[in-house]
Interface confidence: low
Amino acid sequence: AGIPEKAFNLTWISTDFKTILEWQPKPTNYTYTVQISDRSRNWKNKCFSTTDTECDLTDEIVKDVTWAYEAKVLSVPRRNSVHGDGDQLVIHGEEPPFTNAPKFLPYRDTNLGQPVIQQFEQDGRKLNVVVKDSLTLVRKNGTFLTLRQVFGKDLGYIITYRKGSSTGKKTNITNTNEFSIDVEEGVSYCFFVQAMIFSRKTNQNSPGSSTVCTEQWKSFLGE
């Protein structure tokens, strides 16, 4: 067996805390094992002896989304076991070749998923737009937390809207999941929303939502 190749291009792929570590190349005569450090700075084996080039680390990183995790991908030689039904680590007292991943701080580094405009509510001449508070994979007391529960007031939404027939757009930023505008009688409005994390330096904004338009509003006088 040749010397295992070190993994390269280690990349975190993470959206709303669903987090996968990817790397290259496809292994030939060796396997990979991923290790991730926990808050006690212990290394935990994940995706043990795999021939995949990705490893789902969600279960580990959601334990504390404000921790900066370290991970590494070990390239482990393999040989047929005596029983021929599996692979064994062959380390010979030395740690196999490994490559460190960039540090991953979920709160800062996970991408925000595409937001969804949940509903419109009319309140007199005001139109309230409600953005769905989507669930994440972060758990507390056995239940999944929403984005708002994780990020608090650090989560905002950029809401861009226009009158249905107009090309002119207006943009507002809110740090809640609701936004209201004064509306005109008989006019349709179209909305487009992006989530954002105020404290971030990079990856600040989510992809935009689908553009959603209201129906033409009936006369406020009930005609």
Partner: antibody
Framework: QVQLVQSGAEVKKPGESLKISCKGS???????IGWVRQMPGKGLEWMGW????????RYSPSFQGQVTISADKSISTAYLQWSSLKASDTAMYYC??????????WGQGTLVTVSS | DIELTQPPSVSVAPGQTARISCSGD??????VSWYQQKPGQAPVLVIY???NRPSGIPERFSGSNSGNTATLTISGTQAEDEADYYC?????????FGGGTKLTVL
Amino acid sequence: QVQLVQSGAEVKKPGESLKISCKGSYSFTSNWIGWVRQMPGKGLEWMGWIYPSDSMTRYSPSFQGQVTISADKSISTAYLQWSSLKASDTAMYYCARYLFGLFDNWGQGTLVTVSS
Amino acid sequence: DIELTQPPSVSVAPGQTARISCSGDNLGSYYVSWYQQKPGQAPVLVIYNDNNRPSGIPERFSGSNSGNTATLTISGTQAEDEADYYCATYDSSTDVFGGGTKLTVL
């Protein structure tokens, strides 16, 4: 305007316990509260933070096991406590509203003097 | 973890531009904030996220951050700007302050 009001100065003897407080005047539970130490004539040192909504804490390695940070969200108050003070704990202690490297509103500070 | 290094002191004549540096390995990839502390007072945030000013902070305060160095710039320095200044950032789940710089307005 956000306000954080800290408890008054304390003079203690080595070995005594102490709990100082930081009361917030805003939506307390949805913000982190950080604690910062400043020893006489020295710079600022981050000690740790708490998220009062669920009392999640994080400590600087330098202060882990030396102090305890807690909060009572029902009265919008965070606490910093020692079980056994040392002379080297003599310092000004500040609480501040906190967000990952950013302390945007500070309390007025609590001076703790430990002397036999 | 990152370490932040500041010069112990910087002097500037009134009306001139003061520049206070804060250096650390690959600091430009982190957000940096700056705090002003006058004697006997609590620190005050003057710059956050590298170059943003909180409301109430005069326009003469500005910040930049690239490479290994963040810089706090005070244009048209006034006597009231004499204070200690601290940079800070967040790395590896730990907040880090620089050692502080005493700004003297001559």
